[in-house]
Interface confidence: low
């Protein structure tokens, strides 16, 4: 049998084979050693017995899509049946105190390969033998600890294969410079050591994509925006657009990248070399956001011009013969670059929202019958922008970290957006008060520290920062979410 008989049905064309040469990979026309590495068709009953205690699942992932010329990395992780794991020696053991449907196992080993390899004979001093080879007969590389690697992974794509000895997780990187654009299929077959042979335990395939477009994604965030994922934002507040380029192999690390923005609101084109930009929409409505990313990326060099005709007789050379076997014009310039582009488009909706909230006055409410240890405090609050429909106060310790009390209630506010919020404080001391006004699309927060005095008629309430605002600067990027009466801070990055 040949590798292509064993590893997959997809047969690439001769053109594909010729134009998709992967560095370090071998042609799947090579012979496969079926005696050492038996081949089972899909549905063969022997698959059921290939692993003790269940089936092993191979999970193949890649960091696709890959920009042509960059490296794409494939990772295969083996998922063992419940209660099984690989130990430091590469043996498969039952997890301690893990109960599967068979109950607790007395034998700690599922597979004790250390014992197998220690008593295996017929090897010379190098540890090399007829069975320490890959399916094509190449010997295993003797990395330190290679004996603890009990799985053989065979990767197959584009008419070529790559063999790797490993543990329960392996990683393989492939340069995509010679790979045809578009979706391609990677198939992996995994074998486990079984005495002096190998047994197939899993097969997995995954589609990966090679593209000439830079993969681009944009995150959008805005202070006071209640839901950053719904692409609805607030008028008159800056939106931060952050461009994420999917470049896991850092192919574009040394490229100059330009970002060309059109915000769809007749503000024209905005060109930047910074991946983050702020933009404020001053009108309500729906706008089409467009981004074009341009990078000068390493790329194939144009074919060299044809060499000049050879002179009829030899010319004196500057150095010994053979120093420069190529004519100067034929020496490739390895630093050729090609412009690559990426595009992103989104439709965003701009609406009114609560832009700002301030506590302008704090007043201790004199109670006719004061509670034993309780103070009522009124906060006079103003806001700008749309009219809030709810107010939440979170009372916490002076560090603003440990919530002591949280209350939300609907509010009915006039056009002037002036309201009074009354809250009770148990006991004297310093408190952090987070006050949030919200409507359907926005949340605006202000914070202040207040000092509640003892219930002494002579004492009076002090606000740490008179005039309101309090810790507003610290908290302005903070988002408050509430569900019933359980409240937590969520930092909104």
């Amino acid at each position: 049998k040949r590798f292509h008989d064993v590893l997959g049905n997809e047969r690439p064309s001769a053109y594909m084979r010729e134009h998709n040469q992967l560095n370090g990979w071998s042609s799947d026309e090579n012979d496969w050693n079926e005696k050492l590495y038996p081949v089972w068709k899909r549905g063969d009953m022997r698959w059921k017995n290939s692993w003790k205690g269940g089936r092993v699942q191979a999970v193949l992932t890649s960091d696709s899509p890959a920009l042509v010329g960059s490296n794409i990395t494939f990772v295969v992780n083996l998922v063992f049946p419940r209660c099984q794991k690989e130990d430091a020696n590469g043996n498969i053991v039952y997890e301690k105190n893990c109960r599967n449907e068979a109950g607790l196992s007395a034998d700690p080993y599922v597979y004790n390969w250390t014992a197998w390899s220690e008593d295996s004979d017929g090897e010379n001093g190098t540890g090399q033998s007829h069975h320490n080879v890959f399916p094509d007969g190449k010997p295993f590389p003797h990395h330190p600890g290679w004996r603890r690697w009990n799985f053989v992974y065979v990767f197959h794509t584009l008419g070529q294969y790559f063999q790797k000895l490993g543990r329960c997780s392996v990683r393989v990187s492939v340069n995509t410079a010679n790979v045809t654009l578009g979706p391609q299929l990677m198939e992996v077959t995994v074998y486990r050591r079984h005495g002096r042979a190998y047994v197939p335990i899993a097969q997995v395939k995954d589609v990966y994509v090679v593209t000439d477009q830079i993969p681009v994604f944009v995150t959008m965030s805005q202070k006071n925006d209640r839901n950053s994922s719904d692409e609805t934002f607030l008028k008159d507040l800056p939106i931060t657009f952050d461009v994420l380029i999917h470049d896991p192999s850092h192919f574009l690390n040394y490229s100059t990248i330009n970002y060309k923005w059109s915000f769809g609101d007749n503000t024209g084109l905005f060109v930047s070399i910074n991946h983050t930009v702020n933009h404020t929409y001053v009108l309500n409505g729906t706008f089409s956001l467009n981004l074009t990313v341009k990078a000068a990326a390493p790329g194939p060099c144009p074919p060299p011009p044809p060499p000049p005709p050879r002179p009829p007789k030899p010319t004196p050379s500057l150095g010994p013969a053979g120093d420069n076997p190529l004519g100067l014009s034929e020496i490739p310039d390895e630093n050729c670059q090609i412009n690559r582009y990426g595009h992103f488009q989104a439709t965003i909706t701009i609406v009114e929202g609560i832009l700002e909230v301030n506590i302008i006055q704090t007043t201790d409410v004199l109670m006719l019958v004061p509670g034993p240890d309780s103070s009522l405090i009124d906060f006079v609050v103003t806001c700008q922008g749309s009219i809030p429909t709810e107010v939440c106060t979170i009372i916490s310790d002076p560090t603003c970290e440990i919530t002591q009390n949280a209350v939300c209630s609907p509010v009915d506010v006039d056009e002037m957006c002036l309201l009074t919020v009354r809250r009770a404080f148990n006991g004297s001391g310093t408190y952090c008060v987070n006050l949030t006004l919200g409507d359907d699309t926005s949340l605006a927060l202000t914070s202040t520290l207040i000092s509640v005095p003892d219930r002494d008629p002579a004492s009076s309430l002090r606000m740490a920062n008179s005039g309101g605002g309090g810790l507003n600067d610290i908290f302005e990027a903070q988002k408050i979410e509430w569900h019933e009466h359980h409240h937590h801070h969520h930092h909104h990055h």
Partner: antibody, heavy 120, light 107 residues
Framework: QLQLQQSGTEVVKPGASVKIPCKAS????????MNWVKQRPGKGLEWIGQ????????NDNGKFEGKATLTVDKSSNTAYIQLSSLTSEDSAVYFC?????????????WGQGTSVTVSS | SIVMTQTPKFLLVSAGDRVTITCKAS??????VAWFQQKPGQSPELLIY???NRYTGVPDRFTGSGYGTDFTFTISTVQAEDLAVYFC?????????FGGGTRLEIK
């Protein structure tokens, strides 16, 4: 050809023990679980336990603890169940049945059964 | 241990009829349910494993379905040779347990 060969009938006295063989052929004995199932006349099926010949790992029904012991002899590809302190409640047909590793309870091939009669 | 409640206990049908047997597990057993056929005087035979997979060589008139606690076994067109007792069995939790059986008789 795949076979699980069991002895036909065993008649034993109350309080005695009996060891029932199940000889496997035609498949990789060490790579399948061997199960034992009890069936009393006109009654349903009761799973006693299973053993993995490859390493002797067992998985037992606690109800039969002290009653049934499962063993294997890999050299002869034979699994055994030993029933001890027999009473009339133990009179039944005992089947051996193999199951694949990852479907350890899906018994895909059964012996013809051994009838045990406990009688004085 | 898991109790498998199998209904009905008895079925009297004519050849060509469609037959459905149900099994209810006392708690979820995922899809780890098998169905067996036991003809008079014979050993049980595996028909369905993993709730819905037909075992090799089993005619396609036998089907299984279900997940969690409720499982169904169907014979789409009963034939004379289907006279037997049918058992469900869960093999998710040890000890593995069988239903009480359904005796199928042909008119």
């Amino acid at each position: 050809q795949l076979q699980l060969q069991q002895s036909g009938t065993e008649v034993v006295k109350p309080g005695a023990s009996v060891k029932i063989p199940c000889k496997a052929s035609g498949y990789a004995f060490s790579s399948y679980w061997m199960n034992w199932v009890k069936q009393r006349p006109g009654k349903g099926l009761e799973w006693i336990g299973q053993i993995y010949p490859g390493d002797g790992d067992t998985n037992d029904n606690g109800k039969f603890e002290g009653k049934a012991t499962l063993t294997v002899d890999k050299s002869s590809n034979t699994a055994y169940i030993q029933l001890s302190s027999l009473t009339s409640e133990d009179s039944a047909v005992y089947f051996c049945a193999r199951s694949p590793l990852h479907l350890r309870g899906s018994m895909d091939y059964w012996g013809q059964g051994t009838s045990v009669t406990v009688s004085s | 241990s898991i109790v498998m409640t199998q209904t009905p206990k008895f079925l009297l049908v004519s050849a060509g009829d469609r037959v459905t047997i149900t099994c209810k597990a006392s708690q979820s057993v995922s899809n780890d349910v098998a169905w067996f056929q036991q003809k008079p005087g014979q050993s049980p035979e595996l028909l369905i494993y993993s709730a819905s997979n037909r075992y090799t060589g089993v005619p396609d008139r036998f089907t299984g379905s279900g997940y969690g606690t409720d499982f169904t076994f169907t014979i789409s067109t009963v034939q004379a040779e289907d006279l037997a007792v049918y058992f469900c069995q869960q093999n998710y939790y040890s000890p593995f347990t069988f239903g009480g059986g359904t005796r199928l008789e042909i008119k």
